[in-house]
Amino acid sequence: EPHSLRYNLTVLSWDGSVQSGFLTEVHLDGQPFLRCDRQKCRAKPQGQWAEDVLGNKTWDRETRDLTGNGKDLRMTLAHIKDQKEGLHSLQEIRVCEIHEDNSTRSSQHFYYDGELFLSQNLETKEWTMPQSSRAQTLAMNVRNFLKEDAMKTKTHYHAMHADCLQELRRYLKSGVVLRRTVPPMVNVTRSEASEGNITVTCRASGFYPWNITLSWRQDGVSLSHDTQQWGDVLPDGNGTYQTWVATRICQGEEQRFTCYMEHSGNHSTHPVPSGKVLVLQSHWQ
């Protein structure tokens, strides 16, 4: 998995008038990291993990950068012609990555009302756009605006390729992010389903990185994919992830089923609690 920094900026217009507020979210290695969601942007770390990465400092630099980008995107939205009545959004997503071999990737993507209409590879400076005529019109509109003023273009790109990578490297220097492994807490619960059946659910939480194997086994053999229900692997707001898997089994056969968990080379099996014990927790070392 490469290390990545992802900026997601959103500005809105109402009946052709660009709104003063904007929303900015920054993800570090896929985790919510910073957020600005007020009329006046104030970079807020998303949880203790983000604070640890940023260190004991104010976030003036981040606030300044994010505010500047928000203003630039509002100006871009103001120049989009043919804005219909009602609510419209312009979204810009910038991503930079550092791979294990130290190679880098950077890209920028624009979305209007949630639809992608323009992308740029920030290393080759190559632009691409979808084939639809609406996307092409929007893309030409935005590219022309960005070309109008070289200085404007420069400020708009001030946190792009080089700066994005510089910020990413700065965050990685904290050591908090760098190839950290946090093992999951696994707990198994049971609930009555239909007569004679129970639903058993295995939850893994608080783990990093996000790659995990979680599955139900009967007598040591995996149940087929279609007999299990999986939850998405989702950020839990603490810089770690959570997920679950559930299946339906016959009451009285609980002892034959185990939840198998594998994460970062470690593995463990977790039995179904019997009788009235509702939760069984275990945390491998």
Epitope: Q218, D219, G220, V221, S222, L223, T227, E253, E262
Partner: antibody
Framework: EVQLVESGGGLVQSGGSLRLSCVAS????????MNWVRQAPGKGLEWISY????????YYADSVKGRFTISRDNAKKSLYLQMNSLRDEDTAVYYC???????????????WGQGTTVTVSS | DIQMTQSPSSLSASVGDRVTITCRAS??????LNWYQQKPGKAPKLLIY???SLQSGVPSRFSGSGSGTDFTLTISSLQPEDFATYYC????????FGGGTKVDIK
């Protein structure tokens, strides 16, 4: 006594079909996951199919996928293997085997039948 | 599919010898590994499950160890009735057997 008895083997022409049966006694078949394993003359063991107790998880080895079908009838205490499009290389002794239900088991087969011989000739 | 490779494919030993058979998986299988003994014309018999747990009724001279990709079956002191073929089997991803190790009299 806990035991498994296979039947249905015999001589069949290449491209033909056979249905093997395995009858359980001494234990409640419906509680157990079951398998078919075969052994070609002078060769090692080859697992070919698995069916769990509720028949909602079924697996096949690549060598038989699409040609063989595993099924069970718990009321008749029987496990079956329908074999179609038989080939010369399917010639073997076919065993049915029970998956142990001991806590902490890892898909181990604790009870085996005596085997039934299938010979495919071209 | 996971491949199971047993070594050696055959070995000659004497009564009283300590015998070690290894089984290697093509990828990590945790402890989802079982060992069987088969004598000519007979069905296989379960010896060890979960890599190291002794099946009920099996003599304590048989032991298993290992986790991940490398596993070992050890017979501490070979007895006349132990001359047979031994197979490992994994259940981590569906099911597969190793190629077998024949133990015969030296």
């Amino acid at each position: 006594e806990v035991q498994l008895v296979e039947s249905g083997g015999g001589l069949v022409q290449s491209g033909g079909s056979l249905r093997l049966s395995c009858v359980a006694s001494g234990f409640t078949l419906s509680r157990y996951s079951m398998n078919w394993v075969r052994q070609a003359p002078g060769k090692g063991l080859e697992w070919i199919s698995y069916i769990n107790s509720r028949s909602n998880t079924i697996y096949y080895a690549d060598s038989v996928k699409g040609r063989f079908t595993i099924s069970r009838d718990n009321a008749k205490k029987s496990l079956y293997l329908q074999m179609n499009s038989l080939r010369d290389e399917d010639t073997a002794v076919y065993y049915c085997a029970r998956v142990s239900d001991i806590t902490g088991n890892t898909g181990a087969f604790d009870i085996w039948g005596q085997g039934t011989t299938v010979t495919v000739s071209s | 599919d996971i491949q199971m490779t047993q070594s050696p494919s055959s070995l000659s030993a004497s009564v009283g010898d300590r015998v070690t058979i290894t089984c290697r998986a093509s990828q990590s299988i945790s402890s989802y590994l079982n060992w069987y003994q088969q004598k000519p014309g007979k069905a296989p018999k379960l010896l060890i499950y979960a890599a190291s747990s002794l099946q009920s009724g099996v003599p304590s001279r048989f032991s298993g160890s290992g986790s991940g990709t490398d596993f070992t079956l050890t017979i501490s002191s070979l007895q006349p009735e132990d001359f047979a073929t031994y197979y490992c089997q994994q259940s981590y991803s569906t099911l597969t057997f190793g190629g077998g190790t024949k133990v015969d009299i030296k």
